[in-house]
Amino acid sequence: EVEKTACPSGKKAREIDESLIFYKKWELEACVDAALLATQMDRVNAIPFTYEQLDVLKHKLDELYPQGYPESVIQHLGYLFLKMSPEDIRKWNVTSLETLKALLEVNKGHEMSPQVATLIDRFVKGRGQLDKDTLDTLTAFYPGYLCSLSPEELSSVPPSSIWAVRPQDLDTCDPRQLDVLYPKARLAFQNMNGSEYFVKIQSFLGGAPTEDLKALSQQNVSMDLATFMKLRTDAVLPLTVAEVQKLLGPHVEGLKAEERHRPVRDWILRQRQDDLDTLGLGLQGGIPNGYLVLDLSMQEALS
């Protein structure tokens, strides 16, 4: 708390301008009217106030707006946003995408802070869903944003928003998140032709079920090994050697380098060795010829 002291003669601020840089903290408190500050917030960012001076200005706004700042002030907070706590931000009602962009711009280059996370949460909850424009904005500032959401939060993403997602936005997503996103992507891209569809859906395939992978294998898609390695193990296991060969096309040769890694390793263990031999890659570990293959999962389902 800054003590309440009278403003010295001739120091009363009529404008928010550079002369205030040289005011002591108590002078700022005493001589700057909070309402004046609120109406001229857009000027604050251009003035080289110290962090301590910004604390005083924030304190004045807090006194003026104890229930939370209006959006007209929030939009022009600039660097003062970095002084806000998550508790402050929870009082705000931010509805304009322009306001969100302005505040994210201030934080650009910084790691995502609790303040930014709270702001985004407030904004998205206020909108009711993660629409395309919002997602576009958030992933532009934070490529990893989508993968920071829980599967429950991702369920509120409408399929139309998926068009805003770039491959790098999914780099850190885990299988549970892709399980939620994949059906939305499938719906979003359903009207595209084969090769265009595959280009768009490729990043989401870590959430694809077996039947969709089988369907893709009939479309000459030539999936690269990096994508194949991100597929769900349980979705890959039922694929036949012929289906994997068709799915990967010329990239099938890459299986040899990955034969010790999931899902390739587990898939090899489920294939007949003579089927694997048809690939001519020297893959080992398949079921020897003459052995009976029991599908235990089918047996469990029947019981």
């Epitope: 550079e18 251009a46 003035i47 080289p48 110290t50 962090y51 910004l54 970095l82 910084h110 802070s113």
Partner: antibody, heavy 117, light 107 residues
Framework: QVQLVESGGGLVKPGGSLRLSCAAS????????MSWIRQAPGKCLEWISY????????YYADSVKGRFTISRDNAKNSLYLQMNSLRAEDTAVYYC??????????WGQGTMVTVSS | AIQMTQSPSSLSASVGDRVTITCRAS??????LAWYQQKPGKAPKLLIY???GLQSGVPSRFSGSGSGTDFTLTISSLQPEDFATYYC?????????FGCGTKVEIK
């Protein structure tokens, strides 16, 4: 009096790690943003990172992003710089400084980091 | 990143001389400029903040002026203890950047 004292410098091989510390006294450490700045022998000053008073806002120069980590412990009045994957070009005197947003008003005496095989 | 260019890179002067050092920013930075003095083997010391604000405890012979892209540090009457290297620094935008210094030597 107001003072910053760095420690933790030394000789390290390329690819190695080092952790620098900066002990603050004479002011309310938890009220202030802090920065690390370095100066290679005979070269210009280079700002490398800052951290907000609460530790929630952090920024790195591109030259150290992904390799260096700034942190602070307000209870101990201390600032840290964890330096990993060190390169020959990281050889410099490293200074911690109090960051007033429009200037660095208090500087430590510096600690020398030499990266050499 | 904003480039800060100082000139001259070095100068020779005598005690009592008026010395002027300039700093140019590659883009407008308002008044977001600071000046520092550094002596060999020592840490930099803040002289001027916000382009023209004299840091507490710094002698009044030091002054700063300018805004936008062109800035000046003036030492009105050079004293023996002023022989050092002077740096400008912008804090208008990240990454924060310094000029490469002006060395003031004894003539």
């Amino acid at each position: 009096q107001v003072q910053l004292v760095e420690s933790g410098g030394g000789l390290v091989k390329p690819g190695g790690s080092l952790r620098l510390s900066c002990a603050a006294s004479g002011f309310t450490f938890s009220d202030h943003y802090m920065s690390w700045i370095r100066q290679a022998p005979g070269k210009c000053l280079e700002w490398i990172s800052y951290i907000s008073n609460s530790g929630s806002t952090i920024y790195y120069a591109d030259s150290v992003k992904g390799r260096f980590t700034i942190s602070r412990d307000n209870a101990k009045n201390s600032l840290y710089l964890q330096m990993n994957s060190l390169r020959a070009e990281d050889t410099a005197v490293y200074y911690c400084a109090r960051d007033q947003r429009n200037a660095f008003d208090i500087w430590g005496q510096g600690t020398m980091v030499t990266v050499s095989s | 990143a904003i480039q800060m260019t100082q000139s001259p890179s070095s100068l020779s002067a005598s005690v009592g001389d008026r010395v002027t050092i300039t700093c140019r920013a590659s883009q407008g930075i308002g008044s977001w400029l600071a000046w520092y003095q550094q002596k060999p083997g020592k840490a930099p010391k803040l002289l001027i903040y916000a382009a023209s604000g004299l840091q507490s405890g710094v002698p009044s012979r030091f002054s700063g002026s300018g805004s936008g892209t062109d800035f000046t540090l003036t030492i009105s009457s050079l004293q023996p203890e002023d022989f050092a290297t002077y740096y400008c620094q912008q804090s208008y935008s990240n990454p924060l950047t310094f000029g490469c210094g002006t060395k003031v030597e004894i003539k």
